[in-house]
């Protein structure tokens, strides 16, 4: 996260770190004790030995001895994510995957699931939401040792597809968030992590997973905001995948 | 809650887990009449509100549990239920003669559990 601040334990209890051979590569969000939602692009061909993945939860410091680490039983990625069929494909829609843990995490003060958007709940342009992660604090910088949080507004797809922004690269199942002048953004290593918005549509205030960190030009550049997978467009995919693949193991695809 | 953020038309009561659906024609909240499809309806209701799943469901009786500010019932069209993703598409106002309605506990989410929200 560029332009963010250190967060404290329990503020974002659904945030997890996806580690391959011990190195943090992506973020993820707990949907339950045993399911994590993340980005499909976190699982290219060269990183598919599931026994080498670990999911780290319940801590804000990457080096914390108090966090829990669990193995991965299965990864369900979206069948419409084209780069897995053709590594040079530039069509990066459907950048979404589910990780099924080898056993459930215990839910504690520091480990809690995030809500999904309610059916039919639309993103609100201009609404300020929060993105979190352990990614780089500068484009060419280092990863954060402590979980970072940053507040950024949702940008309409019309604006984000403008010539000065991303010129029609923002597809319907994506959205942008950030400031036109830049300065605050997700960055390398934040992929797959949560973009959450708080609302009270269920009477109790709750945080909902509105976006998954996906891509962008550089980090925190003017007129190049972060681009996110729009979770509301994948509600049914998530429910179906969890119902269908709860016993699966290995890399699984679902359209 | 701000004026721009109305309540979602499906709600679950924190008191007794009853499911309530807003009737926008009448401007009232209705209970969901119990049926053989309670498990599916509970699951669909929880999913619709943004919860991952229903953990349990049960039946309550309006005579003992009370209406608690609701007014009447919706019944589920069980024939259309398997083919829908939206509860609101398969319900209609009904009498619910037995007065038994659906309650569900959804998997909680999106809330910090700290003693003091920092």
């Amino acid at each position: 996260i560029v332009g963010g601040r250190d967060t404290s334990l329990g503020r974002w209890p659904w945030q997890v770190s996806l580690r391959y051979d011990g190195a943090h590569l992506c973020g993820g969000s707990l949907l339950s004790g045993d399911w994590v939602l993340t980005a499909a692009h976190c699982f290219p061909e060269r990183n598919r030995v599931l026994s080498r993945w670990r999911v780290f939860a319940g801590a804000v410091a990457q080096a914390s001895p108090h966090g829990l680490q669990l193995g991965v039983q299965a990864v369900v990625y979206h069948g419409g994510y084209l780069p897995f069929r053709d590594p040079n494909s530039e069509e990066n829609s459907n950048d979404i995957a589910l990780v099924h843990l080898s056993s459930p995490l215990p839910l504690t003060e520091y480990i809690q699931p995030v809500c999904l958007p309610a059916a039919g709940q639309a993103l609100v342009d201009g609404k300020i939401c929060t993105v979190t992660g352990w990614g780089n604090t500068q484009y060419y910088g280092q990863q954060a040792g402590v979980l970072q949080e940053a507040r950024v507004p949702i940008i309409s797809n019309d604006v984000c597809n403008g010539a000065d922004f991303y010129g029609n690269q923002i597809k319907p199942k994506m959205f942008c968030a950030g400031y036109p002048e830049g300065g605050i953004d997700a960055c390398q290593g934040d992929s797959g992590g949560p973009f959450v918005c708080e609302d009270s549509i269920s009477r109790t205030p709750r945080w909902r997973l509105c976006g998954i960190v996906s891509w962008g030009t550089g980090c925190a550049l003017a007129q190049k905001p972060g681009v996110y997978t729009k979770v509301s467009d994948f509600r049914e995919w998530i429910f179906q995948a969890i119902k269908t693949h709860s016993e699966a193991s290995g890399m699984v695809t679902q359209l | 809650r701000s004026d721009q953020e109305p309540l979602y038309p499906v709600q679950v009561s924190s008191a007794d887990a009853r499911l309530m659906v807003f009737d926008k024609t009448e401007g009232t909240w209705r209970l969901l009449c119990s049926s053989r499809s309670n498990a599916r309806v509970a699951g669909l209701s929880c999913e619709e509100m943004g919860f991952l799943r229903a953990l349990t469901h049960s039946e309550l009786d309006v005579r003992t549990a009370g209406a608690n500010g609701t007014s009447g019932f919706f019944c589920v069209d069980e024939g259309r239920l398997p083919h829908t993703q939206r509860l609101l598409e398969v319900i209609s106002v009904c009498d619910c003669p037995r007065g038994r309605f659906l309650a569900a506990i959804c998997q909680d989410c999106g809330r910090r559990k700290l003693p003091v929200d920092r």
Partner: antibody, heavy 130, light 107 residues
């Protein structure tokens, strides 16, 4: 507003040298690919060279490799094409163009993607003749 | 090297006609194909990228079938008489190659 302005063209003898400049404004130069594309009189478009200045990566067409050098000065938002050992067949209008780049935000070594040449300069004519 | 074979090299059409130009890549280029319009004495202008992104204006559209790429002008307008080029930018987005061009003339 995005603008690319080429300069430095002119008449040069075979074997001579010329340096073209492309002054860029209205976008983040460091994170864009800059390209030179040429068009011989009455002919089609031919790609010449590209640079991704953030990493300093440079790429050349076989026809100019070893003779032409692409470079960029990010402090001046300017791309250059140094052309040495010029030949008659290098006679063309030389266009400067840019393409946007993007990358995933995972912790892997990044692959930088681009999306076609979205802005072009007006072109500068290079004539190689004795 | 990847070759882009464009056809036809020229065509005559009337205002309102539907016009199709095709480009065949000598090997897989995924969807990394762009289409450009060039008018005499002017710089080329990007119409379509990623084979089938939305054209501006919307009467321009692109499609892909394997290694065959098509630019379609749904209803030719007077300002559309120009030369059109396809281009691939697949190989790590360098070694870019253009098709030979298609000149669209007034019938």
């Amino acid at each position: 507003e995005v603008q690319l302005v080429e300069s430095g063209g002119g008449l040069v003898q075979p074997g001579g040298s010329l340096r073209l400049s492309c002054a860029a404004s209205g976008f983040n130069f460091s994170y864009s690919y800059m390209h030179w594309v040429r068009q011989a009189p009455g002919k089609g478009l031919e790609w010449v060279a590209s640079i991704y200045s953030y990493y300093g990566s440079t790429y050349y067409a076989d026809s100019v490799k070893g003779r032409f050098t692409i470079s960029a000065d990010t402090s001046k938002n300017t791309a250059y094409l140094q052309m040495n050992s010029l030949r008659a067949e290098d006679t063309a209008v030389y266009y400067c163009a840019r393409s946007d780049s993007w990358s995933y935000k995972s912790g892997y070594t990044q692959k930088i993607y681009s999306k076609g040449l979205d802005y072009w300069g007006q072109g500068t004519l290079v004539t190689v003749s004795s | 090297d990847i070759q882009m074979t464009q056809s036809p090299s020229s065509l005559s059409a009337s205002v309102g006609d539907r016009v199709t130009i095709t480009c065949r890549a000598s090997q897989s280029v995924s969807s990394a194909v762009a289409w450009y319009q060039q008018k005499p004495g002017k710089a080329p202008k990007l119409l379509i990228y990623s084979a089938s992104s939305k054209g501006v204006p919307s009467r321009f559209s692109g499609s892909r079938s394997g290694t065959d790429f098509t630019l379609t002008i749904s209803s030719l307008q007077p300002e559309d008489f120009a030369t059109y080029y396809c281009q691939q930018y697949y190989s790590s987005y360098y070694l870019l190659t253009f098709g030979q061009g298609t000149k669209v003339e007034i019938k």
